[in-house]
Interface confidence: low
């Protein structure tokens, strides 16, 4: 008498999440009499997946009619596959008895579930940094299977190389997560720059997912300050201007001081944007020279984006005021944060 064989022809089957999986199983003989059952996993902790005779298995259906005479095909179809369904499935023949006795198992079919990664989420630094500093961006994507995945970083279309990427967990799992950190050196021209995290996976059929972050949320471009005196007016008033240029973000407060005393404070708002995304602002102060006996020290004090104030001072020469037409005397630099004066 030929020994009964339980044949599971596929060693592995890969299915997309949400689809149906067909697990094939045939037996070589109708003898001995007894049922076929499907299990996930082996050993005492195995999970019953399908038993024709009893139980309720709403997602599992037999491929062929198991009640027909001489049926030797015990393949099943599992619908609405999720990553949690991954594992090795065994088709097992039992000999009829009280109770039934396990006779022979198939070699097993490993079901792997192809699950799409979630849309990559890119997050930037919590605080802004200035040009020449390095900032880190993080990209996360979750819920994918199989584990093989490719992640690339781009800045303005150019691939970044200072990248560290981890896929978790390291061992077998129903689904995986990827987390990658890219280090980017900022330049003053990066207000309009963008970083892109691109994730490629077998489930995406060549159409990678992308997450983006704007460097405008990560960068601070400190202003240039220049204080100049315009021409003296006939009424003995001097117009002194403070030009604040090439700064980002727009959050900026400017204070004029006359001989150390606050004269006027202004907040920048609704400024036109430069081509590179930065802003310029010009403020002016009229000084009545005839009201002063001594030279007047004017200070333009700028607080940008919560940073320490930067000063630039300028002395208006009262003694020479009748002749100082169109003077453009160089401003004296008394910045409390010298790095921000260019």
């Amino acid at each position: 008498e030929e020994e009964l064989q339980v044949i599971q022809p596929e060693k592995s089957v890969s299915v997309a999440a949400g689809d149906s999986a067909t697990l094939n199983c045939t037996v070589s003989s109708l003898i001995p009499v007894g049922p076929i059952q499907w299990f996930r996993g082996a050993g005492p902790g195995r999970e019953l997946i399908y038993n024709l005779k009893e139980g309720h298995f709403p997602r599992v259906t037999p491929v062929s009619d198991p009640t027909k005479r001489n049926n030797m095909d015990f393949s099943i179809r599992i619908s609405n596959i999720t990553p949690a369904d991954a594992g090795t499935y065994y088709c097992v023949k039992f000999r009829k008895g009280s109770p039934d006795v396990e006779l022979k198992s198939g070699a097993g079919t490993e079901l792997s579930v192809r699950a799409k990664p979630s849309a990559p989420v890119v997050s930037g630094p919590a605080v802004r940094a200035t040009a020449e500093h390095t900032v880190s961006f993080t990209c996360e994507s979750h819920g994918f299977s199989p584990r093989d995945i490719t992640l690339k970083w781009f800045k303005n279309g150019n691939e970044l190389s200072d990248v560290q990427t981890n896929v978790d967990p390291a061992g077998k799992s129903v689904s995986y997560s990827i987390r990658s950190t890219a280090r980017v050196v900022l330049t003053r021209r990066d207000v309009h720059s963008q970083v892109i995290c691109e994730v490629a996976h077998v489930t995406l059929q060549g159409d990678p997912l992308r997450g983006t972050a704007n460097l405008s949320e990560a960068i601070r471009v400190p202003p240039f300050l220049e204080v100049t005196q315009q021409s003296m007016r006939a009424d003995n008033q001097v117009n002194v201007t403070c030009q604040v240029t090439k700064f980002y973000p727009q959050r900026l407060q400017l204070t004029w001081l006359e001989n150390g005393n606050v004269s006027r404070t202004e907040m920048a708002s609704a400024l036109p944007e430069n081509k590179d995304g930065t802003y310029n602002w010009t403020s002016w102060l009229l000084v009545n020279v005839s009201a002063h006996r001594d030279d007047v020290k004017l200070t333009c004090q700028v607080e940008h984006d919560g940073q320490p104030a930067v000063n630039k001072s300028f002395s208006v020469k009262v003694s020479a005021h009748p002749k100082e037409q169109g003077s453009n005397t160089a401003a004296e630099n008394t910045g409390t944060n010298e790095r921000n004066i260019y």
């Epitope: 949400g18 609405n80 799409k116 979630s118 849309a119 989420v121 996360e140 979750h142 819920g143």
Partner: antibody
Framework: EVQMLESGGGLVQPGGSLRLSCAAS????????MSWVRQAPGKGLEWVSA????????HYADSVKGRFTISRDNSKNTLYLQMNSLRAEDTAVYYC??????????????WGQGTTVTVSS | EIVMTQSPATLSVSPGERATLSCRAS??????LAWYQQKSGQAPRLLIY???TRATGIPARFSGSGSGTEFTLTISSLQSEDFAGYYC?????????FGQGTKLEIK
């Protein structure tokens, strides 16, 4: 038993601030992304904000961006929502919810019972 | 942002009958869609995720289908406890967005 309990709701004037808390128990808090969802009186559900398990990534609805901040303290198993510059239209029941296992990928399968925020002068 | 539109706003069905609720997305959300049930005065409960996968403990009479922009929640034989509000939510693109809801009431 898996539980989430919100607190910190109340009556606040327009322009004011509130901080909501959500204390979680019965599961490994740091392994799950969390979310805040609100429901104005007689209206439908509105997703407000989400934060990853590690706290490294956050997301906001356009209606609250720049005013609300989501955060978490995994050592205390607590989720927070700092609400500033509150408006009358922020009046709602605020629910905290946990995503089901795979971070943001599936639905929110554990919910608190909600805390009421009323913004009125 | 992706706009989710549910129809009808109110659905009147007799107990034991089938109820079919629809949800449409303004652009494709793949299968990244969840359905929630909310009873009056209670927090929402997750019914379906991945467009068609039942959440833990959800009875087999609840089923979801669809992909892309068109989705359906079907309750095969309505029980008294099923009369409630139902919401769909997409989680394909930030910000995640809910539909405006369908109220299922006893006919």
């Amino acid at each position: 038993e898996v539980q989430m309990l919100e607190s910190g709701g109340g009556l606040v004037q327009p322009g004011g601030s509130l901080r909501l808390s959500c204390a979680a128990s019965g599961f490994t808090f740091s392994s799950y992304a969390m979310s805040w969802v609100r429901q104005a009186p007689g209206k439908g559900l509105e997703w407000v904000s989400a934060i990853s398990g590690s706290g490294s990534s956050t997301h906001y609805a356009d209606s609250v961006k720049g005013r609300f901040t989501i955060s978490r303290d995994n050592s205390k198993n607590t989720l927070y929502l700092q609400m500033n510059s509150l408006r009358a239209e922020d009046t709602a029941v605020y629910y905290c919810a946990a995503y089901s296992g795979s971070y943001y990928y599936y639905g929110m399968d554990v919910w608190g019972q909600g805390t009421t925020v009323t913004v009125s002068s | 942002e992706i706009v989710m539109t549910q129809s009808p706003a109110t659905l009147s069905v007799s107990p034991g009958e089938r109820a079919t609720l629809s949800c449409r997305a303004s652009q494709s959300v793949s299968r990244n869609l969840a359905w929630y049930q909310q009873k009056s005065g209670q927090a929402p409960r997750l019914l379906i995720y991945g467009a068609s996968t039942r959440a833990t403990g959800i009875p087999a009479r609840f089923s979801g289908s669809g992909s892309g922009t068109e989705f359906t929640l079907t309750i095969s034989s309505l029980q008294s406890e099923d009369f409630a509000g139902y919401y769909c939510q997409q989680y394909n693109n930030w910000p995640y967005t809910f539909g405006q809801g369908t109220k299922l009431e006893i006919k």
